[in-house]
């Protein structure tokens, strides 16, 4: 008789998850030397272990503690860049820029990119038919947990000048809301952290707009200062033009307005 | 290939003022992250201040900090460093720099691209 099994209104694990996180993990090991020493079965084990029998809307940031710990990594705490609903942007810029860093060009972030993941109470089985979502079920699942904790982890590393790429697009440009807005923002450490950068990519064409002016942008500008954190913002209007000045700053059309 | 013209330096006595410029030509100045530095006699080129490609936000060397200010005119590219009660110890050859990748901002001289000629402070007590 089959048992019966829990309908959440998120889609289920990612196929194929245990092989995609530890392919993903020899290979970024592979290709970076100073994570050489990390054994991928150990991080794919404390992974598994984080949400694993576990009641899928009962995990909490602990679960998550051994994998943190295999999976430390320093970057350079001033060349990180945040972003927020404009991911591919984000990681074209780091591609480009090596020695800039998003939560997705670690280790952790990388295995764990676009995923989906989760388990059932008191069963060793991975549901591949559905997960929770974080609104319609709730917030304390795996996959947010993992994103919180990592992404909390990311933000308190960082220092001197950090950047952050929002989309210029979207109706609040500066979302509350967002893994940014309600986790990176607050755990930035004023003592480290000097300034907060804003990178306000426009989406039109012919967009001449100063969307710094935006109030979404003035409230991150409020909320940042009030954590004594500098605040500068910037507009990017052609994001094509930008990632060729990325490319080769001497290029000659960067002679212009980005 | 940017330019950089730095002027206004000169003799001060201690606990006076000097406003030093940096013209730039070449580049869109809005693109470009500028920087100070200087350099005394047998010592390392230091760090002495920069501001964030939006040109809205500064940074500072401690041995400054609270004395000296940045600023920029992008109507008229140029960068500008306020010194204020200024002392012997600031007495140094002053640099005005330019990074290309503007949206890198650092105060490492070997990530910054071109320099200005510098210009000569020197307080006396």
């Known amino acids: 008789v089959p048992r019966w099994r829990q309908q959440w209104s998120g889609p289920g694990t990612t196929k194929r998850f245990p092989e995609t996180v530890l392919a993903r993990c020899v290979k970024y090991t592979e290709i970076h030397p100073e994570m050489r020493h990390v054994d991928c079965q150990s991080v794919w084990d404390a992974f598994k272990g984080a949400f694993i029998s576990k009641h899928p809307c009962n995990i909490t940031e602990e679960d998550y503690q051994p994998l943190m710990k295999l999976g430390t990594q320093t970057v350079p705490c001033n060349k990180i860049l945040l972003w927020s609903r404009i991911k591919d942007l984000a990681h074209q810029f780091t591609q480009v820029q090596r020695d800039m860093f998003t939560l997705e060009d670690t280790l952790l972030g990388y295995l764990a990119d676009d995923l989906t993941w989760c388990g059932e109470f008191n069963t060793s089985k991975i549901n591949y038919q559905s997960c929770p979502d974080w609104r319609k079920d709730c917030s304390n699942n795996p996959v947010s947990v993992f994103w919180k904790t990592v992404s909390r982890r990311f933000a308190e590393a960082a220092c001197d000048v950090v950047h952050v790429m929002l989309n210029g697009s979207r109706s609040k440009i500066f979302d509350k809301n967002s893994t940014f807005g309600s986790v990176e923002v607050h755990n930035l450490q004023p003592e480290k952290v000097q300034t907060l950068e804003a990178w306000v990519i426009h989406g039109g064409r012919e967009d001449s707009r100063d969307l710094c002016q935006d109030p979404t942008i003035k409230e991150l500008e409020s909320i940042i200062s009030k954590r004594n954190i500098q605040f500068s913002c910037k507009n990017i209007y052609r994001p094509d033009k930008f990632l060729q000045c990325v490319k080769n700053p001497e290029d000659s059309s960067c002679t212009s307005e980005i | 290939e940017v330019q950089l013209v730095e002027s206004g330096g000169g003799l001060v006595q201690a606990g006076e003022s000097l406003r030093l410029s940096c013209a730039a030509s070449g580049r869109t100045f809005t693109n470009l992250g500028m920087g100070w530095f200087r350099q005394a006699p047998g010592k390392e080129r230091e760090f002495v201040a920069a501001d964030t490609w939006s040109g809205t936000s500064t940074w500072y060397g401690d041995s400054v900090k609270g004395r000296f200010t940045i600023s920029r005119d992008n109507a008229k590219n140029t960068v500008y460093l306020q010194m204020n009660n200024l002392k012997p110890e600031d007495t140094a050859v002053y640099y005005c720099?330019?990074?290309?990748?503007?949206?890198?901002?650092?105060?490492?001289?070997?990530?910054?691209?071109?320099w200005g000629q510098g210009t000569q402070v020197t307080v006396a007590s």
């Open positions: 720099a330019a990074r290309l990748r503007g949206w890198i901002t650092t105060r490492k001289p070997n990530e910054y691209d071109y």
